[in-house]
């Protein structure tokens, strides 16, 4: 498979936002790239979000997506928001070179995202 690199561990902010870079080694000059974030928990894999972009253009996720991102060359900066403690898990970056042919696929080893719910503020008199 195509080589895909991503950090091993990321800690989400107190606002439930986690960011990481997904970098891939392209064999050639792809013009259309698809990036998918998958969450693996208890051997179940679910799709978190996905975006297709043209090289040189911005990465666009659907309006209701919890992901945003920017691309630069063979690097994609991904941000996942709205995370809670129960969302702690392994987030895998999948990269597909869609056009021109041939099709190339790469799967990262995953980024373990830790999310800690903030303690509620104590009532003040």
């Amino acid at each position: 498979a195509m080589h895909v690199a991503q950090p091993a561990v990321v800690l989400a902010s107190s606002r439930g936002i986690a960011s990481f870079v997904c970098e891939y080694a392209s064999p050639g000059k792809a013009t259309e790239v698809r990036v998918t974030v998958l969450r693996q928990a208890d051997s179940q894999v679910t799709e978190v979000c996905a975006a297709t972009y043209m090289m040189g253009n911005e990465l666009t996720f659907l309006d209701d997506s919890i992901c945003t991102g920017t691309s630069s060359g063979n690097q994609v900066n991904l941000t996942i928001q709205g995370l809670r403690a129960m969302d702690t898990g392994l987030y895998i970056c999948k990269v597909e070179l869609m056009y021109p042919p041939p099709y190339y696929l790469g799967i990262g080893n995953g980024t373990q995202i830790y999310v800690i719910d903030p303690e509620p503020c104590p009532d003040s008199d």
């Epitope: 498979a1 080589h3 080694a25 392209s26 064999p27 050639g28 000059k29 998958l38 894999v45 895998i92 999948k94 597909e96 869609m98 042919p101 041939p102 099709y103 190339y104 696929l105 799967i107």
Partner: antibody, heavy 115, light 106 residues
Framework: EVKLDETGGGLVQPGRPIKLSCVAS????????MNWVRQSPEKGLEWLAQ??????????YYSDSVKGRFTISRDDSKSSVYLQMNNLRGEDMGIYYC??????WGQGTLVTVSA | DIQMTQSPASLSASVGETVTITCGTS??????LNWYQRKQGKSPQLLIF???NLADGMSSRFSGSGSGRQYSLKISSLHPDDVATYYC?????????FGSGTKLEI
């Protein structure tokens, strides 16, 4: 127009070697990983070997059935990929295709192994 | 190594019908699955790549679906020209194993 032309097939005795060649045109050869795939009535389509390109340090991969006997190589200056096949066996008979990462395929070259 | 289980081995259908071929894998291949059509005496042709994407020049009557360990190829409104052997293939990682093939007769 994309073209892949395999040559070098023919009749070969068991235990003897043979070298297949494939010349590509119509696409940027050096941007692609190249593969050899065999078709036989017994096994259908069987992936044999892959050679990656310069960004991947020309890494090679083989199926267990040919590892140690077959060698894949490439020459980007000639847009060519090769398959050196040694110590041929009866089960190596079939049509051999070269393919640019499974998107583009040649017409195939027939290898017959017989005494 | 990733094992591919393709079924059925052969199938007969009539013009205009819809048929489905399935391919199971021994582990999650994350959508890294291609489908090919091989007509008698011809080279294999890429039909579907990445489990769901139709290859250039192929009829939209062909569609691919699936994820994880289960995938399928659907051929709608069968044409006589669809007579061929269809193969699935793991393209996630080496060895890039093919399924055993499905021979379609019309």
């Amino acid at each position: 127009e994309v073209k892949l032309d395999e040559t070098g097939g023919g009749l070969v005795q068991p235990g003897r070697p043979i070298k297949l060649s494939c010349v590509a045109s119509g696409f940027t050869f050096s941007d692609n990983w190249m593969n050899w795939v065999r078709q036989s009535p017994e096994k259908g389509l069987e992936w044999l070997a892959q050679i990656r390109n310069k960004p991947y340090n020309y890494e090679t991969y083989y199926s267990d059935s040919v590892k140690g006997r077959f060698t894949i190589s490439r020459d980007d200056s000639k847009s060519s990929v090769y398959l050196q096949m040694n110590n041929l066996r009866g089960e190596d008979m079939g049509i051999y295709y070269c393919t640019a990462q499974f998107a583009y395929w040649g017409q195939g070259t027939l290898v017959t192994v017989s005494a | 190594d990733i094992q591919m289980t393709q079924s059925p081995a052969s199938l007969s259908a009539s013009v205009g019908e819809t048929v489905t071929i399935t391919c199971g894998t021994s582990e999650n291949i994350y959508g890294g699955l291609n489908w090919y059509q091989r007509k008698q005496g011809k080279s294999p042709q890429l039909l579907i790549f990445g489990a769901t994407n139709l290859a250039d020049g192929m009829s939209s009557r062909f569609s691919g679906s699936g994820s994880g360990r289960q995938y399928s190829l659907k051929i709608s409104s069968l044409h006589p020209d669809d007579v061929a052997t269809y193969y699935c293939q793991n393209v996630l990682r080496s060895p890039f194993t093919f399924g055993s093939g499905t021979k379609l007769e019309i």
